[in-house]
Interface confidence: low
């Protein structure tokens, strides 16, 4: 039952008329080359649209900006360019929206050739703006303190770090020669500085500084730094080891007061580390292979970010463009999807349901045939197109999509065979977090989730003008079409409020006549399609991760199972903006699968038991932890971070303080004398990349 209506799909009565009454066109009298949108606040209905037209002339850029504001989810817009004094706004900095529902907005003006700059700030969701002169030219977008939106941090084009405590009115310079700065927890600022030069040279000689009082005092928390990053509770730094060009990853969970070496494989000069994902429990770390292979190994950490277990070999991660397909499936706990580069250089998709414990191929969709890449026409897998395919300019308009409040739903472009195909992909959907898949739409599409999964909307990816939108109220089983305009438009994007709680979708594009083109948006409100609020009878109980209902431990992942209340596919009703995912957790008995291998141990292929690393047999397991030599008494297991199991298997584990001093605090790395039997990784060369969700920045 893919694409259009099959024999068991009956269309919703009067849908066209209901949608026609809720379709709002807005034509922008604007010829600008680009448009950027920003939702201001959650559930406010406020959208700012910034259009930009710019022409580079010699060393400067001349341009024009227009600002539009909507208060009704994009159904109508008002030209409010006068609020920013018709100033040219730097589109590369975008619209900086304040955290939570602060209503704060910052627009950075382009004041070419000036020693300072100008920002326009709003505290009332963009209703009014005031302008503030800056005593510096920003190098990148100004960032808000996540916990106090009045406090702003900026890095200048002269690598000065500036701070404002009054939402941009007054600024003070905190530090010179700052290469990178980030907000930490509770108003802490971390930054790297070069005390004897510039940021482009001597990158391995940076100091990592911390201030907890907005720059009144500073503490150097680490030296010989190449780069640093924050993810969950973890602070990571790549540090020159004192052995020439080698670098090592160090980790702190106390904001840099104490550090430990990450027990990762050593890496050579041309390799890199990357944090693929991190939360307060654990980290996914990619370690690049030697040579220009385009792949590496994923390791998963313990709860301290110190001990790592091998999770996935031959993980695709190109060094050229820094592309990886690693995707957190946010609609189901513990699920991640990524790509591997197989021996024959084909790319295959792998999925884990247990936070990297085991990886498998995606099950073949029941309604699909194996394509030409399959050796056996009866046995093949689904392979998902993500960042790498998009970077290779394949016909893939969107990366995989999942939303935390649309439980179990994953939508992605893919092909069915032995590997990713370069042929035109189709769109597939999973309603159980990636265990099973169905072809949803033929050919490439743009797609979005509305009303917490109550509606899925799609538009065909085409080079021709379009005027038809497709929608489904049953998680992609049956589709209806709606012609939203008589005059087709050149489609540029689908826009819906982040969080998938809205019932409005905006279709952006432009119309072209003989001499001119102009921006146009169509906003469609689906509230009359979902006429009533969902009631209890509209929901059904669903056990997540269920693969064998006969097994008492069915659904146990990371030590517990969860039952969810999910909307029945047959129910056509509104979850509503206030919808909260209702779940019932149950603790499971512990098994060996609830433990990762401890320091000095590893899991042989297809075995749940941890065995001692051959090179460590007969050695005391001693390692340096928080500046003390520790002796580890273990039978090889450590509880997986975030695992909640109780009872059952309970391997013994004890760490004894050997009362010997050692150093893993690398303020003076040359003095290290730790017996670190896990060969802490040094890395050099290209890029150590740290991030908390999708790759945030490259070294």
């Amino acid at each position: 039952r893919s694409t259009e209506q099959g024999e068991s799909c009956s269309g919703l009565l009067g849908a066209d008329a209901k949608l026609a009454g809720n379709t709002h066109q807005h034509i922008f009298n604007d010829l600008s080359g680009s448009v950027s949108l920003a939702w201001v606040g959650d559930g406010t209905g406020v959208i700012l649209a910034l259009t930009t037209f710019q022409v580079p002339i010699f060393m400067i850029t001349i341009g024009q900006s227009k600002l539009y504001r909507s208060e009704d989810y994009g159904k109508s817009f008002e030209d409010v360019t006068n609020l920013i004094n018709n100033t040219f706004i730097r589109s590369d900095f975008g619209i900086a929206i304040g955290p939570e529902n602060s209503g704060k907005v910052i627009l950075t003006a382009d004041v070419s050739g000036s020693h300072g700059s100008r920002i326009f700030v709003s505290s009332d969701f963009g209703k009014s703006f005031t302008h503030q002169e800056l005593p510096f030219v920003p190098l990148m977008q100004i960032t808000y303190n996540p916990e106090n939106s009045n406090v702003l941090l900026a890095l200048s084009n002269k690598n000065e770090l500036w701070l404002s405590e009054d939402f941009g009115t007054n600024w003070k310079k905190l530090y010179d020669t700052v290469c990178l700065a980030k907000w930490g927890r509770k108003g802490t600022i971390f930054f790297t500085a070069n005390h004897n030069g510039s940021c482009s040279n001597d990158r391995g000689m940076l100091e990592l500084e911390r201030t907890t009082d907005y720059g009144k005092s500073f503490k150097t928390v680490a030296s010989k730094i190449y780069s640093f990053g924050l993810g969950g509770k973890f602070l990571f730094a790549s540090v020159m080891t004192g052995k020439g060009t080698l670098r090592a990853i160090h980790v702190s969970v106390d904001d840099g007061d104490t550090w430990n070496m990450a027990q990762l494989p050593s890496v050579g000069q041309e390799q890199f580390y990357s944090i693929l994902a991190a939360n307060d429990d654990m980290v996914f770390m990619h370690v690049d292979e030697p040579g220009d292979t385009g792949f590496g190994t994923i390791f998963t950490s313990d709860d301290r970010g110190i001990v790592y277990s091998k999770s996935l070999d031959r993980h695709l991660y190109t060094t050229t463009g820094g592309e990886t397909d690693f995707t957190n499936v946010t609609s189901l706990r513990g699920v991640y999807i990524t790509s591997v580069l197989s021996e024959d250089n084909s790319i295959q998709t792998m999925i884990t349901f247990d936070q990297g414990g085991r990886w498998t191929h995606l099950r073949k969709p029941e309604n699909s045939e194996c394509d030409a890449t399959a050796k056996n026409k009866n046995e093949c897998s689904l392979h998902i197109h993500a960042s790498y395919s998009i970077s290779q300019k394949l016909n893939v308009p969107m990366a995989p999509l999942s939303e935390p409040n649309a439980v179990g739903i994953v939508i992605a472009h893919g092909s069915v065979g032995d590997a990713i195909s370069v042929m035109v992909p189709d769109v597939y959907i999973s309603d159980d977090g990636g265990y099973s898949w169905t072809k949803m739409l033929e050919g490439p599409h743009y797609y979005t989730i509305l009303d917490s999964g109550g509606i899925i909307v799609a538009i065909e990816h085409s080079s021709r003008p379009i005027n038809v939108i497709k929608f489904s109220t049953d998680e992609g089983q049956c589709w209806q079409t709606y012609t939203f305009t008589r005059d087709p438009i050149y489609f540029t994007g689908l826009a819906s409020e982040p969080g998938a709680r809205s019932m409005n979708i905006s279709i952006w594009g432009f119309t072209e006549s003989f001499l001119t083109s102009q921006w146009v948006s169509y906003t469609i409100d689906f509230k009359d399609i979902l006429e009533r609020n969902c009631e209890e009878k509209d929901y059904t109980i669903w056990l997540a991760h269920s693969t064998d209902p006969e097994d008492y431990e069915d659904g146990c992942i990371l030590g517990y199972k969860e039952q969810f209340l999910r909307l029945r596919k047959s129910s056509v009703c509104q979850n509503g903006r206030d919808y909260v995912v209702t779940k019932q957790p149950s603790i499971c008995l512990c098994s060996l699968e609830d433990f990762l291998c401890d320091f000095g141990y590893y899991r042989p292929e297809n075995d749940s038991k941890c065995v001692e690393q051959p090179e460590l047999k007969g050695h005391d397991l001693e390692f340096c932890l928080y500046g003390r030599e520790e002796h580890l008494t273990t039978n090889g297991y450590r509880k997986i971070p975030g695992d909640k199991c109780q009872g059952g298997v309970n391997p013994v584990r004890e760490v004894k303080d050997l009362k010997k001093k050692c150093t893993s605090n690398f303020l003076s790395p040359e003095k290290q004398n730790s017996k670190s039997n896990g060969s802490a990784g040094g890395s050099g060369g290209l890029n150590d990349i740290f991030e908390a969700q999708k790759i945030e920045w490259h070294e």
Partner: antibody, heavy 117, light 108 residues
């Protein structure tokens, strides 16, 4: 540490109304199903009502349907039970409880509701 | 409506003895059954949920078994603090619960 603190109990005449509150702390309140359970003096436990995490789904034991309303304010981490048209047989200690699996893993200390003329 | 029956109504035993409490449902409740202990003047305490899972902090002498309609709570060796009233409770539907009448375990 998970804590549930009920309040609002007291003496009320038959036909009267009371509103019980339960203030929760120590866990992500909005993510959990919450319930009210009562116990008449010297008697066993009786489930009264349950509400889903977002507040959109509720259920009641037959004897209180149409008279009692369960609700929650996730911004205040508070569960409520509005009791109207109270009867003598509603006299009981009312417990607020957090759901876990098939049961209730944390309970408040209870608040006594006495319906008497 | 699903009705739970507990037997015996009272169980008189000595410390150190094994206690076996029974709970029967009028129709299948799968494994959605919980057991509680209640002492005078106190709120109930969850012992077992989903028929056989011990709740946090509950000693190993308490165990639950059964599925469908017949369930058992076993206390392998009674401690003095175990003398109390024990209730079973089922969840037949997502948001519908019922309790059994209780079994009193007292000192012989």
């Amino acid at each position: 540490e998970v804590q549930l603190l009920e309040s609002g109990g007291g003496l009320v005449q038959p036909g009267g109304s009371l509103r019980l509150s339960c203030e929760a702390s120590g866990f992500t309140f909005r993510s959990y199903v919450m319930s009210w359970v009562r116990q008449a003096p010297g008697k066993g436990l009786e489930w009264v009502s349950t509400i889903s995490g977002g507040g959109g789904n509720t259920n009641y034991t037959d004897s209180v349907k149409g008279r009692f309303t369960i609700s929650r304010d996730n911004s205040k981490n508070t569960l409520y039970l509005q009791m109207n048209s109270l009867r003598a047989e509603d006299t009981a200690v009312y417990y607020c409880a957090k759901n876990w699996g098939s049961g209730f893993d944390y309970w408040g200390q209870g608040t006594l509701v006495t319906v008497s003329s | 409506e699903i009705v739970l029956t507990q037997s015996p109504a009272t169980l008189s035993l000595s410390p150190g003895e094994r206690a076996t409490l029974s709970c029967r449902a009028s129709q299948s409740v799968s494994s959605y059954l919980a057991w509680y202990q209640q002492k005078p003047g106190q709120a109930p305490r969850l012992l077992i949920y989903d028929a056989s899972n011990r709740a946090t902090g509950i000693p190993a002498r308490f165990s639950g078994s059964g599925s469908g309609t017949d369930f058992t709570l076993t206390i392998s060796s009674l401690e003095p603090e175990d003398f109390a009233v024990y209730y079973c409770q089922q969840r037949s539907n997502w948001l519908i619960f019922t309790f059994g009448p209780g079994t009193k375990v007292d000192i012989k």
